[in-house]
Interface confidence: low
């Protein structure tokens, strides 16, 4: 029902935030957490943070790692705390970026996400718990 809502969104996760985009904050909330590594002018730039809109994270997290950038994504409170993204090494196959570190995860089920075909509505993610 349209107005049956309280329980503050159980599908937003607390994520560790590290890097320029975090400002003075050391955490953020989003629908996915990430840890990334990129090479910028020869320097390794590590970042951690969150994707606040699921579709944004869905696209980025499915991007295969390249020699210049890798992103690992996860869903769960602080799930990116102990994740360090790694660039692929020559001649070695690199696991997909959706390897979700299950021991720290509360994975969203396929049913919760509405399947691959259905774009998830942010509004659906915002329902509070209701008895």
């Amino acid at each position: 029902m349209e107005d049956e809502k309280p329980k503050v969104n159980p599908k937003l996760y607390m994520c560790v935030c590290e890097g320029l985009s975090c400002g003075n904050e050391d955490h953020c909330e989003g629908q996915q957490c990430f840890s990334s590594l990129s090479i910028n002018d020869g320097f390794h730039v590590y970042q951690k943070g969150c994707f606040q809109v699921y579709e944004q994270g869905k696209m980025t997290c499915k991007t295969p790692p390249s020699p210049g950038q890798a992103v690992e994504c996860c869903q769960g409170d602080w799930c990116n705390r102990n994740i360090t993204a790694q660039l692929p090494t020559k001649g070695k196959s690199f696991p997909g970026t959706q390897n979700f570190h299950l021991e720290e995860q509360k994975l969203i089920s396929e049913e919760d996400l509405g399947g691959e075909q259905k774009l998830i509505s942010e509004e659906d993610l915002h329902h509070h718990h209701h008895h």
Partner: antibody
Framework: QVQLQQWGAGLLKPSETLSLTCAVY????????WSWIRQPPGKGLEWLGE???????NNNPSLASRVTISVDTSKSQFSLRLTSVTAADTATYYC?????????WGQGTRVTVSS | IQMTQSPSSLSASVGDRVTITCQAS??????LNWYQQKPGQAPNLLIY???NLLPGVPSRFSGSGSGTDFSFTISSLQPEDIATYYC?????????FGGGTTVAIRR
Amino acid sequence: QVQLQQWGAGLLKPSETLSLTCAVYNGSFSSFYWSWIRQPPGKGLEWLGEINHRGRTNNNPSLASRVTISVDTSKSQFSLRLTSVTAADTATYYCTAHTRGFLYWGQGTRVTVSS
Amino acid sequence: IQMTQSPSSLSASVGDRVTITCQASQDINNYLNWYQQKPGQAPNLLIYDVFNLLPGVPSRFSGSGSGTDFSFTISSLQPEDIATYYCQHYDDLPLTFGGGTTVAIRR
């Protein structure tokens, strides 16, 4: 990350309408619920109501129909209107961003109702 | 849902263990948060979902409880902990806070 900046009139007469606006910076507007909370001088916190990016609202029944919360996603702003104010509405009003908790807060606006 | 917090104020010495309790008028399914508010500032979320500390929150703060009865503990009170602490539930609307507990340092 998310920053909230709020503004509005600080001095009102009884029966006037309180109007406050909160601007959201560095945050996805669709990722949070946006609430107003007030705190009378020396007292506790009272949740007034909330809105999401689509304009769906939930208000505290204790304020009946006096509260209106609206959103302008194009400006990343949300607003509070409280009609027919009395001295009992004197408080510091905060805008907040929340999911499971009120994680981000505006700086607060002190509103005094006095004749 | 009413949230009853006690005591309303307390005074303790630096290094003391301080405990605040919060009782909900019905089962809130562990949807309980704790906030710290220092004078002249907005409240600050310390603990969400009963016992989860936000990053940067000192480990001397902890939360526990379930169902309707919850507690918040400062294991070793520090001068910078002088503040008012609030519990808040989000199991149903309206979202409500406890009345607050003001913590002072005993001289």
